[in-house]
Every structure is written in structure tokens, then in C-alpha cells.
């Protein structure tokens, strides 16, 4: 069956409560004409920030067409939860689904749409919308990536030594010199997901006095300098 | 491939009641929502509502609620637009369009029924 | 019910140029990332046919010299460069709710 491509379009704006909201739907450039029956998975892998508000799309298909309304919820470690629109009866029901965060945008006889408030580390997963139509099933998947921003910190451990830790940050942060050093790069894995990166790095050559840790992340990247002493200087910390 | 062949063009008295026949082929008939649109000469496109021959479920544009219905024959992958009491405003071209799925778009027309009322 | 109004009610352009119609929406014909509405083309005697779908996403079989675009009440349909055969009557037409369609614009080649 013909399948629409990935083109994809993120919108961002800021709700009332003060939290980032992103929508993820498809793009209106990406539809392929001739649809027919069951149409295959169609996927899109989609990093979150974590603490914001997401919305999940389903297929562009009214209401008059659809019989049952879908989302398929597979999170790490739990059961599969569903919740279901029925047209003929508007009765919604649900399965295996503890989360109060994730819940539908509204009616579902209204909007389709999946919401998640306050993103959290847990909400990692699959997320699928099944619109039933008479004449086969339309589907839209979702990895949902949850991005955590890391801490970074800067600071002189010894003579012309300097340590770059991006701390906690989901996924790992790159760490990168300038100038470039005799670096060692080391991670360590938390157990709700997060990775520290730690970056120490040496310039024997002294007319290098200022260097740069640029830390690059995919929500947003870092830069911090600090003037190498004779002696540890003071310690410097931001979030990205 | 998708076809909707309408019945023919109809003259009809004020006061009198049409049925204009839609007969679909190349698809599932009861698998998409049908709906009936109407252009008097010279102007634009007016819908006047939809049917859903899959469960039978119809919605009218509020204009036409109580002088027009929708029904539809899985038997003869017919859908057919009934219009009573017929006055001289009512002539104008019916049309018939499938919708599609995806986007809701209607990608497939009737050839269009001329209806006339005039004594 | 969304009104759509089109603007301009006709025009007149010469081959090689291009014809912009512009359609308004009493309200947002936008949801979910997605815009409900479509574009048609109609020449006499003709039952209309589908140009553009979801605003900017064109018909199998329509040339690309026709395109969309617009979101939530303000949409536009482009011909460029415009061909003596697309002597027509244009109509946009929104799809969320209950079904309208614009007035029409009337496109001549001069």
C-alpha cells in the first residue's frame, strides 16, 4: 500500500502554565495519493524535552469515516495500554493504562489527539494511533525519545588540567576542545537512563592560557571557557 | 477503477419531489461516505449533505434539513438524494462525490443531474 | 457553519503569468497539524475536479505548475505559469466539519 514519507514538521509554543508544548503531526508536503486498504507502519522517531507537554497526531481522516479510534501505549517495563474510541456507541474505554499524564487532547469524538503532560524519563516509549475505517486500517507511530538537558560543569583539577562533565543528560552529550588537548573521555551510565560524561583534558604547550569545553546535546549546545593557572582557579557550572 | 454513473436529467412541477440516483463501481460501495452537492446556472457549489452507506449515518447542511434525504442501496451500490417540494430555486445541476480517506478529500465525481422545475 | 470567502471573484491573466487565488475561513479549517482544505477546478459542463488536498498537497495526475498553501484561515491557490487550458472556475472547500465551499473565482487567459 502506498505510505506517506517522513517529512515532518515540529511546532513549539508556550502554554498558559508556562510549560514548552510540542506537537509533532506530518507535514502537509509528505502525503502520497493512493491510498489503498491497510496502510503499512508508518514511523517517526521524536525527541522530547523532558518537563514539556507533547501532542501525538493521528492520521488526517474525519470522523464520519472511522470506527474505532486507537492509541497504543508501550512504555519500558509496563503492560500495553490502550485507549479506544468506539463511533457507534461514543464510549471510550481503556486498558492496562495507570499514567493520569497521558490522556486524549479532548473528546475523542472531537479530537483524535494524544496528549502528554509534564514529560518524564518514564514516558519513553512507542506510541501508536489505529483509525479502523470500513476499508482497512490507517496507522502513526511514534518513537518518543525523552530529552533530559545535562548540567555542565568546567573547572582546573591540576597544573594545566581542566575537566568538562556534562552530568546526567539523556542521551549522552558530546564533548568537544579548543583548542584540542590530550583528552581521556570517560561515560557513566545512571539507572533511570542518563548518562555523565566526563572530558579531562592537558595542553603542555604554554601559550595556550584560555580553552574552550564545548558540550553539543540535542537540546541545545554549551560553551565554557576557563583560564588555565598554575593553580586550580575556580569551578564553573551552567545548564545548557 | 472508481466510477459514479448518475441518472439522467429530470423536469419536474413546483411542489413535486426528485430522487437522483448515484450507482457506484470499482471500489467497496459501503466502505466511503457519499455526498451530494448542487450548482444552479451560473453559480457556485452548495453542498447538501453526506451519507454513510457502511452504518447508514447522513448529516445535512442546515439549509436543506427537512426537504432532503440521503439513503442509500448496498444491494445496487446505489446512493440516491430524494428532494421534496420542489420550487423553481431548487434547479440547478446535482453532483455526487466520493470521499476519500485520507485528507477527506473528494477525489471522485458524478457526472452531474440536471434538475429543472418549472410550470 | 465556516464561511469560506475566495478573493478575487475573477481575473484575467495572460499565458506565462501567474494567478493567485486567495481563500479566507470564518474560522481555523486546522487541526492536528493538518489544514482541511482542498482546491478544485471546474470548466463548463464539467463536475469539479480535486487540484489540491490539505492545502498544499497536489492530486495525482495535476500538473505542478498548480500549488498550495496556507494554514488555519488563510489559504492560496497558485498557478505558475499559467496555460490557456486552465480557463476555469477555481473553488476551495473545507473538509473538518460540516462541508462549504467558497464562491468561486473565475480564471480568464487573456
Known amino acids: 500500500a502506498a505510505q506517506p514519507n517522513n517529512s515532518l514538521m515540529l511546532q513549539t509554543s508556550k502554554e498558559n502554565h508556562a510549560l514548552a508544548s510540542s506537537s509533532l503531526c506530518m507535514d502537509e508536503k509528505q502525503i502520497t495519493q493512493n491510498y489503498s486498504k491497510v496502510l503499512a507502519e508508518v514511523n517517526t522517531s521524536w525527541p522530547v524535552k523532558m518537563a514539556t507537554n507533547a501532542v501525538l497526531c493521528c492520521p488526517p481522516i474525519a470522523l464520519r469515516n472511522l470506527i474505532i479510534i486507537t492509541w497504543e501505549i508501550i512504555l519500558r517495563g509496563q503492560p500495553s495500554c490502550t485507549k479506544a474510541y468506539k463511533k457507534e456507541t461514543n464510549e471510550t474505554k481503556e486498558t492496562n493504562c495507570t499514567d493520569e499524564r497521558i490522556t486524549w487532547v479532548s473528546r475523542p469524538d472531537q479530537n483524535s489527539d494524544l496528549q502528554i503532560r509534564t514529560v518524564a524519563i518514564t514516558h519513553d516509549g512507542y506510541y501508536r494511533c489505529i483509525m479502523v475505517t470500513p476499508d482497512g486500517n490507517f496507522h502513526r507511530g511514534y518513537h518518543l525519545q525523552v530529552l533530559v538537558t545535562p548540567e555542565v560543569t568546567l573547572f582546573q583539577n591540576r597544573n594545566r588540567t581542566a575537566v568538562c562533565k556534562a552530568v546526567a543528560g539523556k542521551p549522552a552529550a558530546h564533548i568537544s576542545w579548543i583548542p584540542e588537548g590530550d583528552c581521556a573521555t570517560k561515560q557513566e551510565y545512571w539507572s533511570n537512563g542518563t548518562v555523565t560524561v566526563k572530558s579531562t583534558c592537558h595542553w603542555e604547550v604554554h601559550n595556550v592560557s584560555t580553552v574552550t569545553c564545548h558540550v553539543s546535546h540535542l537540546t541545545g549546545n554549551k560553551s565554557l571557557y576557563i583560564e588555565l593557572l598554575p593553580v586550580p582557579g575556580a569551578k564553573k557550572s551552567a545548564k545548557l | 477503477q472508481v466510477q459514479l454513473v448518475q441518472s439522467g436529467a429530470e423536469v419536474k412541477k413546483p411542489g413535486a419531489s426528485v430522487k437522483v440516483s448515484c450507482k457506484a463501481s470499482?471500489?467497496?460501495?459501503?466502505?466511503?461516505?457519499m455526498h451530494w452537492v448542487r450548482q444552479a446556472p451560473g453559480q457556485g457549489l452548495e453542498w447538501i449533505g453526506y451519507?454513510?452507506?457502511?452504518?447508514?449515518?447522513?448529516n445535512y447542511n442546515e439549509k436543506f434539513k427537512g426537504r432532503a434525504t440521503l439513503t442509500s442501496d448496498k444491494s445496487t451500490s446505489t446512493a440516491y438524494m430524494e428532494l421534496s417540494s420542489l420550487r423553481s430555486e431548487d434547479t440547478a445541476v446535482y453532483y455526487c462525490?466520493?470521499?476519500?480517506?485520507?485528507?477527506?478529500?473528494?477525489?471522485?465525481w458524478g457526472q452531474g443531474t440536471l434538475v429543472t422545475v418549472s410550470s | 457553519d465556516i464561511v469560506l470567502t475566495q478573493s478575487p471573484a475573477s481575473l484575467a491573466v495572460s499565458p506565462g503569468q501567474r494567478a493567485t487565488i486567495t481563500c479566507r475561513a470564518s474560522?481555523?479549517?486546522?487541526?492536528?497539524?493538518?489544514?482541511?482544505m482542498h482546491w478544485y477546478q471546474q470548466k463548463p459542463g464539467q463536475p469539479p475536479k480535486l487540484l489540491i488536498y490539505?492545502?498544499?498537497n497536489l492530486e495525482s495526475g495535476v500538473p505542478a505548475r498548480f500549488s498550495g498553501s496556507g494554514s488555519g484561515t488563510d489559504f492560496t491557490l497558485t498557478i505558475n505559469p499559467v496555460e490557456a487550458n486552465d480557463t476555469a472556475n477555481y473553488y476551495c472547500?473545507?473538509?473538518?466539519?460540516?462541508?462549504?465551499f467558497g464562491q468561486g473565482t473565475k480564471v480568464e487567459i487573456k
Open positions: 462525490a466520493r470521499e476519500d480517506y485520507y485528507g477527506s478529500r473528494w477525489g471522485y
Open positions: 472547500q473545507h473538509s473538518r466539519e460540516l462541508l462549504t
Open positions: 470499482g471500489y467497496t460501495f459501503t466502505s466511503y461516505v
Open positions: 490539505l492545502a498544499s
Open positions: 451519507i454513510n452507506p457502511y452504518n447508514d449515518d447522513t
Open positions: 474560522k481555523s479549517v486546522s487541526t492536528s497539524g493538518y489544514s482541511y
